[in-house]
């Protein structure tokens, strides 16, 4: 697009991941400029003709927006003057993955930065004691993952032990035919021990912990995005 201003301004983006079917954010910041009407933000995607989003003269201009992003994008308009050009993306799709460019023009100059956006599915695992089994077992379930993750079990007492022989993991395709439900059962568990179910793909890593004692069951889950 046409550039005015002789200087280059610093534009910063962060590699991020989007969860299919959820809403995501593509992060981009730039040197602030109090003159809102002089700020132009353009988001582009490699391989796509037209724009992902454009914001100029204090408002959106979606006249050049590509059809695949229709009704799905917004900038944080009240934060543009403080240098936030991040883009909200509704209902993230697998096809949204790729290289995006955040172009900025202000009265101070112009600049741009690329962002690698990964898409997949990731969710928190939940571990429960499976009382239906013939022997005491644990059931780890996570509703939405893509691509297919690896699942591993660990135990605080038996550190370094390989539980693959005493566990069974299955992947069930969800109704939208992309994401999958992960179910892993660990057999022959012992009481007064903490077990961890770890689910990981190239986008995220999730861990569910469960501590089973005579008197109580304690659970904890965490999710970490990789390379973000």
């Amino acid at each position: 697009f046409g550039i005015s201003g002789k200087h280059f301004i610093t534009v910063t983006t962060f590699t991020s991941a989007g969860n299919i079917g959820e809403d995501g954010t593509l992060s981009c910041t730039f040197e602030p400029d109090i003159k809102l009407n002089g700020i132009v933000i353009q988001w582009l995607k490699e391989g796509i003709k037209g724009l992902v989003h454009e914001f100029k003269e204090g408002k959106d201009d979606l006249s050049q927006q590509h059809e695949m992003f229709r009704g799905r994008t917004a900038v944080f308009a009240d934060q543009v003057v403080v240098g936030n050009a991040s883009l909200r993306l509704k209902n993230v799709q697998l096809t949204d993955a790729g290289t995006y460019t955040c172009y900025i023009r202000t009265s101070k100059g112009k600049g741009n930065a690329n962002l690698e956006y990964k898409t997949g599915a990731f969710s928190m695992p939940e571990i429960n004691v499976d009382y239906n089994a013939s022997s005491e077992s644990l059931r780890c379930e996570a509703p939405r993952w893509f691509p297919q993750p690896t699942v591993a079990w660990a135990s605080q007492v038996d550190q370094g032990a390989n539980f693959s022989e005493v566990s069974n993991t299955s992947f069930e395709l969800n109704s939208e035919n992309v994401t999958m439900k992960v179910v892993s059962v660990l057999y022959n568990v012992t009481i007064n021990n903490t077990y961890s179910c770890m689910i990981e793909n190239d986008i995220a890593k999730a861990t569910g912990d469960i501590k089973v004692t005579d008197s109580e069951v304690k659970r904890r889950s965490q999710l970490q995005l990789l390379n973000s």
Partner: antibody
Framework: QLQLQESGPGLVKPSETLSLTCTVS??????????WGWIRQPPGKGLEWIGN???????YYNPSLKSRVTISVDTSKNQFSLKLSSVTAADTAVYYC????????????WGQGTLVTVSS | EIVMTQSPATLSVSPGERATLSCRAS??????LAWYQQKPGQAPRLLIY???TRATGIPARFSGSGSGTEFTLTISSLQSEDFAVYYC?????????FGGGTKVEIK
Amino acid sequence: QLQLQESGPGLVKPSETLSLTCTVSGGSIKSGSHYWGWIRQPPGKGLEWIGNIYYSGSTYYNPSLKSRVTISVDTSKNQFSLKLSSVTAADTAVYYCAREGSYPNWLDPWGQGTLVTVSS
Amino acid sequence: EIVMTQSPATLSVSPGERATLSCRASQSVSSNLAWYQQKPGQAPRLLIYGASTRATGIPARFSGSGSGTEFTLTISSLQSEDFAVYYCQQYHSFPFTFGGGTKVEIK
């Protein structure tokens, strides 16, 4: 304060084309952060989203009506229009126009609606 | 398309009481949900968007909650002007779709 007003014939014959216009006042149809939509409501029933248009002319239609619907815009008159072809009695409804957020895509405000009856 | 289901179809409540309306989506719509109020002979009016954000000028007695597939509109203390039909609408994916509505009537 933004206002929308639907206008057009209240009676259309079966197999003909229903044509309605929505006039926007108190604001510009060229607002960058909004689409302009049509919604209908058969008597005593629920709401059905028909489609929307951006001031530049790009449209999106409900697939269930896509083959029969055309939405157009006239920025010089601050108006947008709906055409629905090959109508039947099932198209009898109150037709509303509304401003639609580009995202979040809420509908606000709405026109007061106009009843279109399809009958010979 | 995403199917929106509202319950109950009719809710009989006395003025001053609390009303709880439910809306369920056939698949996750994240927080991309709006609530509208419609009185007889009038156009719908936006109450809530983003599942929980009140639109401009909407009284604090209206509140929305939920995400994913289960949503609730709560009217904390019903006023006479609140008796109407309420619709939920998802704008998560095209085509945008509405629930069948819940009629809140005087008990």
